[in-house]
């Protein structure tokens, strides 16, 4: 079952995904796609990184964190109801069937009608356990467990405040991390 995240229409949605590079600058290609992770690659790719940089992206989809440190969390700008659905974060670790796949379900709620200068947004997330990745063949593909639900409240939806907030660190500390090497 997919990990679920929520955002309101008009806000920015945040879908966390992390890995720990084996060495600084030793990056692993990552792709984000709309739809559950298929067997290979990502379907309906919205953003892709390679060993050096973001090499493909579409409008409204961007990486807000420091992807060079393994923060490949996806931000979707100014969401609409049509953005609801499952998203795939795929960490493309070299080797046979080594990729780590995460399906994240985004639920978009209609905007609250009561105007307010700042609105609260709730994130409810069950994060995958930390995993030290080792080579494994097709018959040994692993299913990741999940930690108990964690409730986080994000006070602001401004992108730069999100970048500077402790949310990314909180998520990383909670174990939503793949360690490479």
């Amino acid at each position: 079952s997919e990990v679920e995240y929520r955002a309101e229409v008009g806000q920015n949605a945040y879908l966390p995904c992390f890995y720990t590079p084996a060495a600084p600058g030793n990056l692993v290609p990552v792709c984000w796609g709309k739809g559950a992770c298929p067997v290979f690659e990502c379907g309906n790719v919205v953003l892709r990184t390679d060993e050096r940089d973001v090499n493909y992206w579409t409008s409204r989809y961007w990486l807000n964190g420091d992807f060079r440190k393994g923060d490949v969390s996806l931000t979707i700008e100014n969401v609409t109801l049509a953005d609801s659905g499952i998203y795939c974060c795929r960490i493309q670790i070299p080797g046979i069937m080594n990729d780590e796949k995460f399906n994240l379900k985004l639920v978009i709620k209609p905007a609250k009608v009561t105007p307010a200068p700042t609105r609260q947004r709730d994130f409810t997330a069950a994060f995958p356990r930390m995993l030290t990745t080792r080579g494994h063949g097709p018959a040994e593909t692993q299913t990741l467990g999940s930690l108990p639900d964690i409730n986080l409240t994000q006070i602001s939806t401004l992108a730069n405040e999100l970048r500077d907030s402790r949310l990314a660190n909180d998520l990383r500390d909670s174990g939503a991390t793949i360690r490479i090497g």
Epitope: G35, P38, F40, E41, G43
Partner: antibody
Framework: EVQLVESGGGLVQPGGSLRLSCAAS????????MSWVRQAPGKGLEWVAN????????YYVDSVKGRFTISRDSAKNSLYLQMNSLRAEDTAMYFC?????????WGQGTLVTVSS | ETVMTQSPATLSVSPGERATLSCRAS??????LAWYQRKPGQAPRLLIY???TRATGIPARFSGSGSGTEFTLTISSLQSEDFAVYYC?????????FGGGTKVEIK
């Protein structure tokens, strides 16, 4: 226009070998996974093998593991399937297909018949 | 492996009528499902991917639906060129697997 043209099929005795080729054109070959899919007479489609863009990952259906080898040459825009220790049950039409997890372009196929 | 079961094996339909083909997966494949058309002597042709997205050049009379384990291909008004064998294929789980096919024949 995307084109995939297979060749190399034919009649071979059980235990024999064949090498199938697929010439690709009309797209950036080096950007796509590629697959071989087969269809035995009167049967359905069966995925056989695929290969990553750079050749670093190759996957096979269990029934051909250890006997078939998929490879590619991006300089020649070509895909290959080396088939050894052929069995009667390998008799089929073999298709080369561009692989996006689903198969969006197919060749016309090349017939492999394994019989004594 | 994920076993894909198609039904019926043969569907007899008159031109102009609606055809509904079913595909069932032995385990969830999310929406990672494709449909193909195969005519004798021709290469298979991709019709639908991601369960409901029509491939380039595919007429609007072809539509796909479903997610998880139950999927449907609908041909709203059969044309003479639509009589063929149709296959579903899942790409959610390794290995990639096809259904056994449904033959749509003229009634």
């Amino acid at each position: 226009e995307v084109q995939l043209v297979e060749s190399g099929g034919g009649l071979v005795q059980p235990g024999g070998s064949l090498r199938l080729s697929c010439a690709a054109s009309g797209f950036t070959f080096s950007s796509y996974w590629m697959s071989w899919v087969r269809q035995a007479p009167g049967k359905g489609l069966e995925w056989v093998a695929n290969i990553k863009q750079d050749g670093s990952e190759k996957y096979y259906v269990d029934s051909v593991k250890g006997r078939f080898t998929i490879s590619r040459d991006s300089a020649k825009n070509s895909l290959y399937l080396q088939m050894n220790s052929l069995r009667a049950e390998d008799t089929a039409m073999y298709f080369c297909a561009r692989d996006s997890n689903f198969f969006d372009y197919w060749g016309q196929g090349t017939l492999v018949t394994v019989s004594s | 492996e994920t076993v894909m079961t198609q039904s019926p094996a043969t569907l007899s339909v008159s031109p102009g009528e609606r055809a509904t083909l079913s595909c069932r997966a032995s385990q969830s494949v999310s929406s990672n499902l494709a449909w193909y058309q195969r005519k004798p002597g021709q290469a298979p042709r991709l019709l639908i991917y991601f369960s409901s997205t029509r491939a380039t050049g595919i007429p609007a009379r072809f539509s796909g639906s479903g997610s998880g384990t139950e999927f449907t291909l609908t041909i709203s008004s059969l044309q003479s060129e639509d009589f063929a064998v149709y296959y579903c294929q899942q790409y959610n789980n390794w290995p990639l697997t096809f259904g056994g096919g449904t033959k749509v024949e003229i009634k």
